[in-house]
Interface confidence: low
Amino acid sequence: QPPPPPDATCHQVRSFFQRLQPGLKWVPETPVPGSDLQVCLPKGPTCCSRKMEEKYQLTARLNMEQLLQSASMELKFLIIQNAAVFQEAFEIVVRHAKNYTNAMFKNNYPSLTPQAFEFVGEFFTDVSLYILGSDINVDDMVNELFDSLFPVIYTQMMNPGLPESVLDINECLRGARRDLKVFGSFPKLIMTQVSKSLQVTRIFLQALNLGIEVINTTDHLKFSKDCGRMLTRMWYCSYCQGLMMVKPCGGYCNVVMQGCMAGVVEIDKYWREYILSLEELVNGMYRIYDMENVLLGLFSTIHDSIQYVQKNGGKLTTTIGKLCAHSQQRQYR
Amino acid sequence: SAYYPEDLFIDKKILKVAHVEHEETLSSRRRELIQKLKSFINFYSALPGYICSHSPVAENDTLCWNGQELVERYSQKAARNGMKNQFNLHELKMKGPEPVVSQIIDKLKHINQLLRTMSVPKGKVLDKSLDEEGLESGDCGDDEDECIGSSGDGMVKVKNQLRFLAELAYDLDVDDAPGNKQHGNQKDNEITTSHS
């Protein structure tokens, strides 16, 4: 059936366009041939001008951006909120773990404080930085903790008679710590647990932050001119014929949207994989892959490692006495 | 400065826990997030349809606009877009994604690879060792998912997990101390706080 005759005076079109663009100079008084139109190609007289067409295209693209943003609002909020909650939660766990460890030293080995507090503090600062993405080696962190602790344990608990004036025995003791496996297999155990749990935690946070980036990227996509033309055709060209109340056909809308969003939809495959991979990671985040479990239990393992040193104290003192004799002689002088 | 003292030690076993789980763990928060994220798994493929359903589209009207003319909603013309001499929809799709989309796809590929690499191999941790098979009693630990309700119906096995304390209000200090380690009874080991 032929379209109904356009509004003889373009009055309806004028009042609608007024809402989009105050100032009426672009709307024809009466229908015109519209030979200059590039998008809303008329089948007869039209109430649209080239300038109006441009305005419609701009509005259509803005509409599309707003629709896209409202579509992703709930998802975006979900990931942003959770990324913040987990970031905060992990920081709290690290803070608690540090305090548990310091408290263990204070209650069980008061002679090792405050040096132990300092080493523990440095260790957990590194842990926090690692989770946030710093390029720190976990094994180095753990080694540094035990390398720093052993000289204090030796001079304060195992051989408290050593004068504190000269400290060059410390370097020898740091070396002896590794050579003699002073703490047994505890440092290795801590390395394994801490590195596994922190790696998983770090990648979990990275994944959430990338999720936000993905949504932000698609949220702020600028749609192409071609897309703008298709949207204008669908949403606004009917107005040129005075058909103000007509809505686009559903199938037609789907075709247009698929065209406009062809690029965005390509993300789908990787987005699905992202969620399923994240689920797999989360399912495995327990025991040594759960930083909460590992870090909050760390003070207990460190306690065990010091007890191990104490248990082997006699043998160690003799061996270290020989190994670091040169340093000790210089100290006694 | 104040904070909550908590129980610290956990038994290395899987617990029987009633389906109502009260105090939460970080792991339950993670699982809840994943469940919610999974409801968005088709987000991108569903976007065109979502946008059409949230913008004016003829639903109950007999007539609708196909880009060129007014047509019957169920006619063949309704799906046509009247763009034949404008530009080709196929061409638009062939252009490929914008550079910014290509970049984000590359980042997704990279994180997906990392996530797969990091995921715990099924055989390793998920293998049930003897102590997890419930040979020991299925008691709940303070630092684990609590037993809520009576045993029997509605009981499920959940993973052993330290309780997470979200204590943001106060900074901790060294005086907030775990008690001396009691090797005799790990189950009932407590953190005590010292007070001035």
Partner: antibody, heavy 120, light 112 residues
Framework: AVQLVESGGGLVRPGGSLKLSCAAS????????MSWVRQTPETRLEWVAY????????YYPDSVKGRFTISRDNAKNTLYLQMSSLKSEDTAMYYC?????????????WGQGTLVTVSA | DVVMTQTPLSLPVSLGDQASISCRSS???????????LHWYLQKPGQSPKVLIY???NRFSGVPDRFSGSGSGTDFTLKISRVEAEDLGVYFC?????????FGGGTKLEIK
Amino acid sequence: AVQLVESGGGLVRPGGSLKLSCAASGFAFSTYGMSWVRQTPETRLEWVAYISSGGATTYYPDSVKGRFTISRDNAKNTLYLQMSSLKSEDTAMYYCASLSIMIRGWFAYWGQGTLVTVSA
Amino acid sequence: DVVMTQTPLSLPVSLGDQASISCRSSQSLVHSNGNTYLHWYLQKPGQSPKVLIYKVSNRFSGVPDRFSGSGSGTDFTLKISRVEAEDLGVYFCSQSTHVPYTFGGGTKLEIK
């Protein structure tokens, strides 16, 4: 400082409804399980509702089950209690309280309360 | 539900005296994990309840050491070694071993 501020209390007829709110600040609300605890005119305390930090789990004792609904909006740091089919025995001061997550059932922070009076 | 019974209902004391409040539960509060979830709260006039002691005998941070908790199974006691003016108010015991969590009826500590 931690603050829990209840509002929405008032006088309501038996069978009526009321919605209480609790605005939280000074702590990570979205990581805490929350509860409503009421105190009757005879000063007796009763635990009436619980909601987990993400809102997935709720719990009600038999005395209010089916009549009260606890909910939360973590974006707004707000806890709610929708009360319907109110009875005279629901007259009480209603407190919102946060649960310590590590110590089972230990109400750590309490608000100042909002008074609900159910009377004809 | 577990019924918590507190005695006495009212406890008049002189400042500096020792005060003792008893709390009895209708069933054992020992959880299957070995812990006993019996807590004490203090509600000062015009205020909301505040935590004092958790799990029978652990003082909350900042609680003076004149407060101590003891007991096991079904019988528990809160002691204040030397009552001070700021200790006046209503003391509640509470259990969270069994769901629903329940409270005692309260004991009012007042000056003689």
